[in-house]
C-alpha cells in the first residue's frame, strides 16, 4: 500500500545554474493524498534557514505530483545560494533536502557603471 | 548613450489590434529586458508585460490574453501587439529598460511615450 | 494584485517646508521605488529600494518604509519639487504603480 505521507522531491546536493535579469522558477515537487499541505520556502543562512516572506509562489498541480514554485522574476546576484522547502502536515514539518542556485552576473564589471554612474546616466 | 524610442500607429479603430516597436540604442537586448507600461487617466500606470533579455515574457495578468511582447535582438527592437483595443486603451505606450542591482531589480531608462488614441 | 495606496492624492507645501507622503500596499513587499513625474514628461526613477535616491537626486529627498508601509519625504520643499510621485513594487506579479501623490508649491 502506498504511503500517504507528505514527500518533497529535491534531490540530495540538486543544484542550478542561472543568470542574473532573467526569470526562474524553483521547483519543489510535492506529493500528498488528500488534503494539500501548507509549502514554504526558506534561504539557508549559516545553519538557520530564514522563511521567504515576500516572495512570488505559486503552484502547479499535474496528474501523480505537485508543485510549489518560488518564482524569481528576475533572478538578481543576492538570490546566490541553497534554498529549502518545507511542509506543514498534521503538525508534522517536513523539510526537503537543500538546493542550490549558482548565479551568473551577465554583466562584466567594465560594462556596469558604478551606482554614480548610473545616476547621473538619467539626467545626460 | 541609452535611449528608447516607441513608434506608434497614433489612431486605432475599436476592435482593431495595435503595433508599437521600441527601438533601443546604448544597450544590448540579450542583457537587459525591455518592459512595457501605459498611462492612462483612468486607470494611472499600468504595467503590461516584458521582454526578458533570455527571450521570455512575463504579462500582466488582466490584459495578458490581448498581449503580446517580441524582439528582434539583430535590430534592437521591441514589439508589443494588442488584440481587440476599445476606448479604455487610449493612453501614453512606454517602453522602458529593467536593471539590476545587487538585490533589487527596477525600471531606469524610459521612452519618450506613444499616445494612442483608441476612436472610430 | 499588490493595491498601492498612496496619501494624500495632492499636496500643496510652501517652500522651505517638510513634506511627507505615503505608500500602503494591500500586502507586504519586499522594497518600493518611487518615480517623478512632471507634466508633458516620461517618469524618473527617484528611489530605488525604498532608500537609495537615483542620480541626481537633491538629497533633502529621503525614503523609508517596510512590510505594507513606505514613505517619500523631502526635508525642506523647493519650487522645482513639485511634480507627481508615485510608488511602484517590484515583488509580485502583476508588477503595480499607486495612483500618484501630486505635490504643489504654495
Known amino acids: 500500500k502506498e504511503s500517504c505521507d507528505v514527500q518533497l522531491y529535491i534531490k540530495r546536493q540538486s543544484r542550478h545554474s542561472i543568470l542574473a535579469g532573467d526569470p526562474f522558477e524553483l521547483e519543489c515537487p510535492v506529493k500528498y493524498c488528500a488534503n494539500r499541505p501548507h509549502v514554504t520556502w526558506c534561504k539557508l543562512n549559516g545553519t538557520t534557514c530564514v522563511k521567504l516572506e515576500d516572495r512570488q509562489t505559486s503552484w502547479k498541480e499535474e496528474k501523480n505530483i505537485s508543485f510549489f514554485i518560488l518564482h524569481f522574476e528576475p533572478v538578481l546576484p543576492n538570490d546566490n545560494g541553497s534554498y529549502r522547502c518545507s511542509a506543514n502536515f498534521q503538525s508534522n514539518l517536513i523539510e526537503s533536502h537543500s538546493t542550490t542556485l549558482y548565479v551568473t552576473d551577465v554583466k562584466s564589471a567594465s560594462e556596469r557603471p558604478s551606482k554614480d554612474e548610473m545616476a547621473s546616466r538619467f539626467w545626460a | 548613450q541609452v535611449q528608447l524610442k516607441e513608434s506608434g500607429p497614433g489612431l486605432v479603430a475599436p476592435s482593431q489590434s495595435l503595433s508599437i516597436t521600441c527601438t533601443v540604442s546604448?544597450?544590448?537586448?540579450?542583457?537587459?529586458?525591455v518592459h512595457w507600461v501605459r498611462q492612462s487617466p483612468g486607470k494611472g500606470l499600468e504595467w503590461l508585460g516584458v521582454?526578458?533579455?533570455?527571450?521570455?515574457?512575463s504579462y500582466n495578468p488582466a490584459p495578458m490574453s490581448r498581449l503580446s511582447i517580441s524582439k528582434d535582438n539583430s535590430k534592437s527592437q521591441v514589439f508589443l501587439k494588442m488584440n481587440s483595443l476599445q476606448t479604455d486603451d487610449t493612453a501614453m505606450y512606454y517602453c522602458?529598460?529593467?536593471?539590476?542591482?545587487?538585490?533589487?531589480?527596477?525600471?531606469?531608462?524610459w521612452g519618450q511615450g506613444t499616445s494612442v488614441t483608441v476612436s472610430s | 494584485q499588490i493595491v498601492l495606496s498612496q496619501s494624500p492624492a495632492i499636496l500643496s507645501a510652501s517652500p522651505g517646508e517638510k513634506v511627507t507622503m505615503t505608500c500602503r500596499a494591500s500586502?507586504?513587499?519586499?522594497?518600493m521605488h518611487w518615480y517623478q513625474q512632471k507634466p508633458g514628461s516620461s517618469p524618473k526613477p527617484w528611489i530605488y529600494?525604498?532608500?537609495n535616491l537615483a542620480s541626481g537626486v537633491p538629497a533633502r529627498f529621503s525614503g523609508s518604509g517596510s512590510g505594507t508601509s513606505y514613505s517619500l519625504t523631502i526635508s525642506r520643499m523647493e519650487a522645482e519639487d513639485a511634480a507627481t510621485y508615485y510608488c511602484?513594487?517590484?515583488?509580485?506579479?502583476?508588477?503595480?504603480f499607486g495612483g500618484g501623490t501630486k505635490l504643489e508649491i504654495k
Open positions: 511602484h513594487q517590484w515583488s509580485s506579479n502583476p508588477y503595480t
Open positions: 521582454m526578458w533579455p533570455g527571450g521570455r515574457t
Open positions: 546604448g544597450f544590448s537586448l540579450t542583457t537587459y529586458g
Open positions: 500586502s507586504s513587499v519586499s522594497y
Open positions: 529600494a525604498t532608500s
Open positions: 522602458v529598460r529593467g536593471d539590476y542591482e545587487y538585490d533589487y531589480y527596477a525600471m531606469d531608462y
